[in-house]
């Protein structure tokens, strides 16, 4: 028979390779079936039969075709800082992500292994840089002329508000405090420019701190705790 | 990044041959088949044949059997498609692009080299 | 050898139009289709593998759908660097064939 007709199994000819979804069987010396993802062999091929292909057993799996005497195992149940966004089936593995609030400190081919809590940037301190899937909260010291006054991994500095007359002058966690019953007006949060305020506190315009790099965890570290990172605080 | 490059334009003449070069890079040369993909002008695509660059073994469709050979130097991750006995039907852009055997798909191609085969 | 054709050589959409392009087995190919992007002067694109798998980096406004004989590559809403010739191709015994492509214009 032409190769393009052969059943499985075949010799191939000299210097051909087997066709889709097959595999050369180097004790055969035949080209054999693979088994499709969910199966694996069963009974490997021999000169005159195929290869016997049988489901995966519960908790494992096989994701492409194959010729595996045994299926692989699914990773553990996820952790309760995780979410399962892929379940176990024959032909895939499970997949655990971090939960909303955590990142993915130490990743794995699929998934994460082991989840952080996000970084929350403490009072006078704001988001520099928010906390992906893969990479934590970074903080800096709120500048002259805007405040934080919460604990938050997502809330950044803002604005003073401007006053006509100022009663307490705000600070990096504190907003101003206007006597007249309402401020002229209110900066929008995240304005880049600060205009000159209308109020007795002087404010020097001057570069923002670099963000603060300091890892927000010490579980990767073999020495033991160490101090939370400048601008933010353990849970 | 993953890719093939081929090398330049040929123009031969009828019953002459051609041999067409694609260079990989950004992967394991020799995990990969590469396939060979052919388009006349204003056609549609027409597979050649594969080369499994770890051993060199082929697969050609029955249509080429005879006029074609595909080789590879793995030293160089180059894979190298010659086609013989030339004829006006053969002009036509040649692709290299890697291939996947169990779903049989494509899924990085070279730019392509233009073969003309005109007397 | 397996043929494959396509319902139509070339289709007229625009910009946001949800636009299918179906292409059909002469015989059953199970899953086995794959769509491709060609552009001129461009390399060919793979986008749709095994009927409906998403080649990665591919955008989620492209699908695929089918079986046996009968394919669809879905476009949801159609953005102006979509405009291209499509093929599919079937990937279930060899020969592996193409289809002739279709041509997606701007209308």
């Known amino acids: 028979l032409p190769a393009q007709v052969a059943f499985t199994p075949y010799a191939p000819e000299p210097g051909s390779t087997c066709r889709l979804r097959e595999y050369y069987d180097q004790t055969a010396q035949m080209c054999c079936s693979k088994c499709s993802p969910g199966q694996h062999a069963k009974v490997f091929c021999t000169k005159t039969s195929d290869t016997v292909c049988d489901s995966c057993e519960d908790s494992t799996y096989t994701q492409l075709w194959n010729w595996v005497p045994e299926c692989l195992s699914c990773g553990s149940r996820c952790s309760s800082d995780q979410v399962e966004t892929q379940a176990c089936t024959r032909e895939q593995n499970r997949i655990c992500t971090c939960r909303p609030g955590w990142y993915c400190a130490l990743s794995k081919q699929e998934g994460c292994r082991l989840c952080a809590p996000l970084r929350k940037c403490r009072p006078g301190f704001g988001v520099a840089r928010p906390g992906t899937e893969t990479s934590d909260v970074v903080c800096k010291p709120c500048a002259p002329g805007t405040f934080s006054n919460t604990t938050s991994s997502t809330d950044i500095c803002r604005p003073h508000q401007i006053c006509n007359v100022v009663a307490i002058p705000g600070n990096a966690s504190m907003d101003a405090v206007c006597t007249s019953t309402s401020p002229t007006r209110s900066m929008a949060p995240g304005a880049v420019h600060l205009p000159q305020p209308v109020s007795t506190r002087s404010q020097h315009t001057q570069p923002t701190p670099e963000p603060s790099t300091a890892p927000s965890t010490s579980f990767l570290l073999p020495m033991g705790p160490s101090p939370p990172a400048e601008g933010s605080t353990g849970d | 990044q993953v890719q093939l490059v081929q090398s330049g334009a040929e123009v031969k003449k009828p019953g002459a041959s051609v041999k067409v070069s694609c260079k990989a890079s950004?992967?394991?040369?020799?995990?990969?088949?590469i396939n060979w993909v052919r388009q006349a002008t204003g056609q549609g695509l027409e597979w050649i044949g594969w080369?499994?660059?770890?051993?060199?073994?082929?697969q050609y469709a029955q249509k080429f059997q005879g006029r074609v050979t595909m080789t590879r130097n793995t030293s160089i991750s180059t894979a190298y498609m010659e086609l013989s006995s030339l004829r006006s039907e053969d002009t036509a852009v040649y692709y290299c692009?890697?291939?996947?055997?169990?779903?049989?798909?494509?899924?990085?191609w070279g730019q392509g080299t233009t073969v003309t085969v005109s007397s | 050898d397996i043929q494959m054709t396509p319902s139509t050589s070339s289709l007229s959409a625009s910009v946001g139009d949800r636009v299918t392009i179906t292409c059909r087995a002469s015989?059953?190919?199970?899953?086995?289709l794959n769509w491709y992007q060609q552009k001129p002067g461009k390399a060919v694109k793979l986008l749709i593998y095994f009927k409906s798998k998403l080649h990665s980096g591919v955008p989620s406004r492209f699908s695929g759908s089918g079986s046996g004989t009968d394919f669809t590559l879905t476009i949801s809403s159609l953005q102006p660097e979509d405009f291209a010739t499509y093929y599919c191709q079937q990937g279930n015994t060899l020969p592996l064939t193409f289809g002739g492509g279709t041509k997606l214009e701007l209308k």
């Open positions: 080369i499994y660059p770890r051993d060199g073994n082929t």
């Open positions: 692009a890697r291939g996947d055997r169990d779903y049989g798909y494509f899924d990085v």
């Open positions: 950004g992967y394991t040369f020799i995990t990969y088949d």
């Open positions: 015989q059953d190919i199970s899953n086995y």
